[in-house]
């Protein structure tokens, strides 16, 4: 058993059939010594008197708030929550696995840039009794800080016949230096609590792994007269690290007809225009990518070609 | 060319070879993603290799103010990654095969450490420690992880030349 | 919790050969290369040996022909044997190891040691 | 080899003072790279194996109180005790593990004046 927060615990249970459990004593927060009883949740029936109560912890049913009582008036509470192992195995109930980039993938990162900050999410089908805590730090042995948000709902989604939600959080680290080699990866770590069931879900990264640039902006099209061609040209986006000259992106153009099948013309350029033959109906895309460091390329860029 | 404790480097020759390390580094191992190194084991080895950090001086205000504390640590880094890729943990079994890219990158290593410090100049005698013996089945986690540090080593590298090639040529 | 020990005969004859075995337990010895140091009475300490995570070895020079450091991986044992002993081979030997890394690392954990006296 | 030459042999420093141990090698043990010196320190009581106190020259191994520290470069190292505690009287060493084979100092001998 561990203090998750004041008067909050939560007991580590080997879930399997006939279980043995884990005994728990629990103290009430008094300086009284006589006449103290204990119930459970919202139960009237008298689980045990004196100033500790010993209980074995199986399920559910053994979890809750216990609280301990003197001639009706209440001394204080200890909710005990349960962290189910099953065959060795932490239990990962509460969250949906994204499967991406590879199975157990719970939390998902991303950084617009180098500064230090960055967004996480996860999915959950979970409408009710839910709760995050989220902590971060650069390494785990002499610990950075990150400070980390509130964790909100920042999506719902019908998936099939089930809702989906999606919470998200955003993180920054306390002293980053965007210019230096990260050694120590960031290590993020969620708390998840749904009714009287704990997990915890981890992740750890470098921020120039889950770097993703938001899309180009200003993306033009200039014609070029007596030609087919149209000079492209798009500019940075304002979230990227500055200045340029050291933050450098890589572009990639596509000229896309209507039609899906259509074959796509590429061209790789690290300059900020291209010269691209725009076809009837077609449509001109810019994505982003670090030029130096192959992280995730940017959503596209789109215009049309008319 | 780069004189210690003096002129500049050939910034743009440099930013050229280090743009082209960076190639070489993800086309030695591209599928970086796809194998996640901190189940592995992986806190030895990332601390047993360079890093470029906060106060080398490699931000863009540092190189402003003295580009050669940055190009030293660079130059450092540079000739331990030579060492490392000219080791048996890449020169032995499980042999690489006849196209890969090792053989170019470390050729590219050894010759931006030249470009920063041609002949006849030294900020010092670069030391590395006797190599832990490696046997076939740990050489390709150490190559991976190796590659892998490398290419974080190198975009630094190739930001630092970049900006230079941009804003501190003559 | 890593732990070694040290086991093997207080005393060997002069000629002979000595040999210990160390028994590491509460760790993966994947990980870990494991050394044996030794130290003569009211003396300093001198390496012998290292035995390294994939199996092969390294000995100090002046040790050389006459040590063997060999494991038995199903066991978790390690084994120490030097040969035509002489009384200048009367230490405490301890067996150590050290983190796999790319380079050889610090003894982090020692066994208690035995005490070997050569002596007719 | 590389010779590991520790001083002074030996130290009587009172309850309280400081206590300082040099050990100097033969060759540098800073890899310029990593910037890391190969290098630790041990503390040895009667009858006990050595216990690592200091590695990479100056972090200092979890557990060992924080009068413990370790500072120096390249050829010269040095272990300082802040304020000298009954229980650490002992004898020191000092190891590298830059090059084979291990080499240690030869002891200093630390006692209460």
């Known amino acids: 058993i561990w203090e998750l927060k004041k008067d909050v615990y939560v007991v580590e249970l080997d879930w399997y059939p006939d279980a043995p459990g884990e005994m728990v004593v629990l103290t009430c927060d008094t300086p009284e010594e006589d006449g103290i009883t204990w119930t459970l949740d919202q139960s009237s029936e008298v689980l045990g008197s004196g100033k500790t109560l010993t209980i074995q912890v199986k399920e559910f049913g053994d979890a809750g708030q216990y609280t301990c009582h003197k001639g009706g008036e209440v001394l204080s509470h200890s909710l005990l929550l349960l962290h189910k192992k099953e065959d060795g195995i932490w239990s990962t109930d509460i969250l949906k696995d994204q499967k991406e980039p590879k199975n157990k993938t719970f939390l998902r990162c991303e950084a617009k840039n180098y500064s230090g900050r960055f967004t996480c999410w996860w999915l959950t089908t979970i409408s009710t009794d839910l709760t995050f805590s989220v902590k971060s730090s650069r390494g785990s042995s002499d610990p950075q800080g990150v400070t980390c948000g509130a964790a909100t709902l920042s999506a719902e989604r019908v998936r099939g016949d089930n809702k989906e939600y999606e919470y998200s959080v955003e993180c920054q680290e306390d002293s980053a230096c965007p210019a230096a080699e990260e050694s120590l990866p960031i290590e993020v770590m969620v708390d998840a609590v749904h009714k009287l069931k704990y997990e915890n879900y981890t992740s750890s990264f470098f921020i120039r792994d889950i770097i993703k640039p938001d899309p180009p902006k200003n993306l033009q099209l200039k014609p070029l007269k007596n030609s087919r061609q149209v000079e492209v040209s798009w500019e940075y986006p304002d979230t990227w690290s500055t200045p340029h000259s050291y933050f450098s992106l890589t572009f990639c153009v596509q000229v896309q007809g209507k039609s899906k099948r259509e074959k796509k013309d590429r061209v790789f350029t690290d300059k900020t225009s291209a010269t691209v033959i725009c076809r009837k109906n077609a449509s001109i895309s810019v994505r982003a990518q670090d030029r130096y460091y192959s992280s995730s390329w940017s959503e596209w860029a789109s215009v049309p070609c008319s | 060319r780069a004189v210690p404790g003096g002129s500049s480097p050939a910034w743009t020759q440099c930013q050229q070879l280090s743009q082209k390390l960076c190639t070489l580094a993800w086309s030695a191992h591209p599928l970086v993603g796809h194998m996640d190194l901190r189940e592995e084991g992986d806190e030895e080895t990332t601390n047993d290799v360079p890093h470029i950090q906060c106060g080398d001086g490699c931000d863009p205000q540092g190189l402003r103010d003295n580009s050669q504390f940055c190009l030293q640590r660079i130059h450092q880094g540079l000739i331990f990654y030579e060492k490392l890729l000219g080791s048996d943990i890449f020169t032995g079994e499980p042999s690489l095969l006849p196209d890969s890219p090792v053989g170019q990158l470390h050729a590219s290593l050894l010759g931006l450490s030249q470009l920063l410090q041609p002949e006849g100049h030294h900020w010092e005698t670069q030391q590395i420690p006797s190599l832990s013996p490696s046997q076939p089945w740990q050489r390709l986690l150490l190559r991976f992880k190796i590659l892998r540090s490398l290419q974080a080593f190198v975009a630094v590298a190739a930001r630092v030349f970049a900006h230079g090639a941009a804003t501190l040529s003559p | 919790q890593v732990q070694l020990q040290e086991s093997g005969p207080g005393l060997v004859k002069p000629s002979e050969t000595l040999s210990l075995t160390c028994t590491v337990s509460g760790g993966s010895l994947s990980s870990y290369n494991v050394h044996w140091i030794r130290q003569p009475p009211g003396k300093g300490l001198e390496w012998i040996g290292v035995?390294?995570?994939?199996?092969?070895?390294d000995y100090n020079p002046s040790l050389k022909s006459r040590v063997t450091i060999s494991r038995d991986t199903s066991k978790n044992q390690f084994s120490l044997k030097l040969s035509s002993v002489t009384a200048a081979d009367t230490a405490v030997y301890y067996c150590?190891?050290?983190?796999?890394?790319?380079?050889?690392?610090?003894?982090?954990?020692w066994g208690q040691g035995t005490l070997v006296t050569v002596s007719s | 080899d590389i010779v590991m030459t520790q001083s002074p042999d030996s130290l009587a420093v009172s309850l309280g003072e400081r206590a300082t141990i040099n050990c100097k090698p033969s060759q540098s043990l800073l890899s310029s790279g990593n910037r890391k010196n190969y290098l630790a320190w041990y503390q040895q009581k009667p009858g006990q194996p050595p216990k690592l106190l200091i590695y990479y020259a100056s972090t200092r191994q979890s557990g060992v109180p924080d009068r413990f520290s370790g500072s120096g470069s390249g050829t010269d190292f040095t272990l300082t005790i802040s304020s000298l505690q009954a229980e650490d009287v002992a004898v020191y060493y000092c190891?590298?593990?830059?090059?084979?084979?291990?080499?240690f100092g030869q002891g200093t001998k630390l006692e209460i004046k």
């Open positions: 190891l590298q593990h830059f090059n084979y084979p291990w080499t």
């Open positions: 150590a190891r050290d983190k796999y890394g790319l380079f050889p690392g610090y003894f982090d954990y």
């Open positions: 035995i390294w995570t994939g199996g092969s070895t």
